[in-house]
């Protein structure tokens, strides 16, 4: 079954998140500075004519681009689009921003710059003060806080009104840790790296972030193909070669926002066995309630059956038995030369009275700081390989 039950559909995650309709209160909108109280952050709501008709920063955004408008969504959301406008001022406003950058945070401390699938950070904005320009964020960002940084190519006044569109991040997944995806060499190179991962990469390990395995995009039967335009072969999948893992498995760790009772994990896998991709032979998961705590009880083991000869990509459901945890560590056993995953999601319920790691207050310092990766993670033997692509210019597979 190729369906990802309990898995969010990014095409349906496009709701206005509350700037225009004021469900985001003024207290959750802030800014680095403003011209005056009449152009304060609270006046930055899309289609609003409050105050002098927009947020306008006091400082120049050229050349430093340090001024920002911040929206606190209070809970983690998947932000799939943003909309911008210039200053209204009863039709007299002339200020708008032709381009801008976005930064986002899940915890209020670590900020990531949004980039498109080809590594471009600058977003085209408005051409006039009144028109609304929507930007489809590919990839979308999982964020609680979003900052808009208006840009200009000379000293000039810029003003912004904004809206964010998306949906609540119900999965509760804060980050996953995994070995860096590898390159498969067929008649052409197939790049199976996690090209939108927003965490850290150290010594062949990615940790502290989210990426393509949690973006809602399910890969095709033929992992060389993608529905995305101008992307390299293998784009939708993250993959690992059996040759690089003497242990016979790939180990991943998942961190969640709060204690949850886990019913199942859904892993969308490729099974194009004529090209070496096979479903995992089995999955083994361990559970713990906190970062420094011991793994609890026996691991959950699940052997995979089904029609392994069927080349269709499919979602594999791994029962997790209602085990309660905030951290999961899962081992995916190789059953062939390659493991290729396009999406991992979880079916879980928040345990009542569990205090959130993210919510009204921010969590304690992250358990894996932006330094060396955890020492208790299985050592990886990664074969040398060429530079992995992060972006692709048209006509070039890796540029």
């Amino acid at each position: 079954d190729a369906d990802m039950k309990g898995h969010f559909d990014p095409a349906k995650c496009r709701y206005a998140l509350g700037m225009q309709d004021r469900t985001i209160p003024d207290s959750d909108i802030s800014a680095s500075s403003s011209w005056s109280d009449s152009t304060a952050a609270r006046h930055s709501r899309l289609e609003s004519s409050d105050g002098d008709g927009a947020w306008c920063p006091a400082g120049s955004v050229f050349p430093k681009e340090e001024e920002y408008l911040q929206v606190d969504l209070q809970r983690l959301h998947l932000v799939a689009l943003v909309g911008t406008q210039g200053r209204h001022a009863g039709g007299l406003g002339k200020e708008f921003s032709r381009s801008y950058r976005l930064r986002y945070s899940r915890d209020g401390r670590r900020w990531m710059g949004w980039k498109d699938r080809w590594g471009q950070e600058v977003i085209s904005g408005n051409e006039d003060p009144e028109g609304v320009v929507l930007k489809d964020l590919g990839p979308p960002m999982v964020a609680r806080l979003v900052r808009f940084y208006p840009r200009a190519d000379r000293v000039m006044s810029v003003c912004l009104r904004v809206e964010l569109y998306g949906c609540l991040w119900r999965d509760g997944l804060l980050s996953y840790t995994a070995p860096v995806g590898q390159t498969m060499y067929l008649s052409e190179a197939v790049y199976l790296n996690d090209s939108t991962y927003d965490g850290h990469t150290v010594g062949g390990l990615q940790y502290g972030g989210l990426g393509q395995l949690a973006d809602g995009v399910v890969g095709l039967d033929d992992f060389r193909k993608s529905q995305e335009l101008r992307v390299w072969p293998g784009y939708d999948y993250v993959g690992w070669s059996n040759h690089s893992f003497s242990s016979g498995y790939v180990e991943m760790e998942f961190e969640f926002d709060r204690l949850r009772a886990f019913q199942a994990m859904q892993v969308h896998c490729n099974n194009m066995h004529t090209l070496g991709a096979r479903l995992p032979g089995g999955v083994e998961c361990r559970f713990r309630r906190g970062p420094a705590m011991a793994w609890e009880g026996e691991p959950m083991r699940h052997n995979l059956g089904g029609n392994l000869g069927d080349p269709r990509a499919r979602a594999v459901s791994v029962p997790l038995g209602g085990r309660v945890a905030r951290f999961l560590q899962c081992r995916f056993l190789f059953a062939g030369p390659w493991l290729l995953f396009s999406e991992i999601s979880f079916i879980s319920d928040v345990v009542n009275n569990s205090s959130p790691a993210l919510g009204g207050t921010f969590p304690p310092a992250p358990w894996w700081p932006p330094g060396p990766p955890p020492t208790n993670f299985s050592s990886l033997e990664l074969e040398p390989r060429g530079q992995q692509p992060v972006a692709k210019a048209e006509g070039s597979p890796t540029a």
């Epitope: 039967d221 193909k225 993608s226 335009l229």
Partner: antibody
């Protein structure tokens, strides 16, 4: 070249197997597909088989057709034909070995008539 | 379910004219689209692959364009030999698909 055979007049419910024979090319290097065309109608994809024997079929064709292959032939079995299965059946070679992509070589087709 | 919708169903143009055939996919298929020409009593013949690439031996009067969900086949300087039915075909996915072909467009050359 690619050539279909086995097309004939049969009564409804009588199983029928069509065979696609390839000459001059290495069949083991390509995915192969069956496509049909009812009189005066458009092209209708039935299914594809790749070099490992993995198959895909049209949603409407499931359970009604079986595709298999040997080192030299690709067969299409119509398990229980109905009058609506009357058509010219084409065998087509894909550009790729592993999945349907596009068809670079077609057979001339074989006519199947289902009539009581 | 991925569906290809071809328009128009039929078009008539004089010799030397230009015909434009559109193929719309119900979801994005990147550039995985091909075009075929079929004449009565013959199998289809590949014209264009990967949305815009001309197949071997096909005259440059045939031009494919588009990406995502909207694709176009343009035939310029029409000749009598171009009278045929033209089909688009998606090559991105064959899972849970009714048909990988569009419904076809008949081109009549006057």
């Amino acid at each position: 070249s690619v050539k279909e055979s086995g097309g004939r007049l049969v009564t409804p419910g009588t199983p029928l197997t069509l065979t696609c024979t390839v000459s001059g090319i290495d069949l083991s290097s390509y995915a192969m597909s069956w496509v049909r065309q009812a009189p005066g109608k458009g092209l209708e994809w039935i299914g594809t088989i790749n070099i490992g024997g993995g198959t895909w079929d049209a949603t409407w064709a499931r359970g009604r057709f079986t595709i298999s292959r040997t080192s030299t032939t690709v067969d299409l079995k119509i398990t229980s034909p109905t009058i609506g299965d009357t058509a010219t059946y084409f065998c087509a070679r894909d550009v790729d070995a592993h999945t349907l992509t596009y068809f670079t070589l077609w057979g001339p087709g074989t006519l199947v008539t289902i009539s009581s | 379910e991925l569906v290809l919708t071809q328009t128009p169903a039929s078009v008539s143009e004089p010799v030397g004219g230009t015909v434009t055939i559109k193929c719309q996919a119900s979801q994005t298929i990147s550039s995985w689209l091909s075009w075929y020409q079929q004449k009565p009593g013959q199998p289809p013949k590949l014209l264009i692959y990967y949305a815009f690439n001309l197949a071997s031996g096909v005259p440059s009067r045939f031009k494919g364009s588009g990406s995502g969900t909207e694709f176009t086949l343009t035939i310029s300087d029409l000749e009598c030999a171009d009278a045929a039915t033209y089909y688009c075909q998606q090559g991105i996915s064959s899972s849970n698909v009714d048909n990988v072909f569009g419904g076809g467009t008949e081109v009549v050359v006057k």
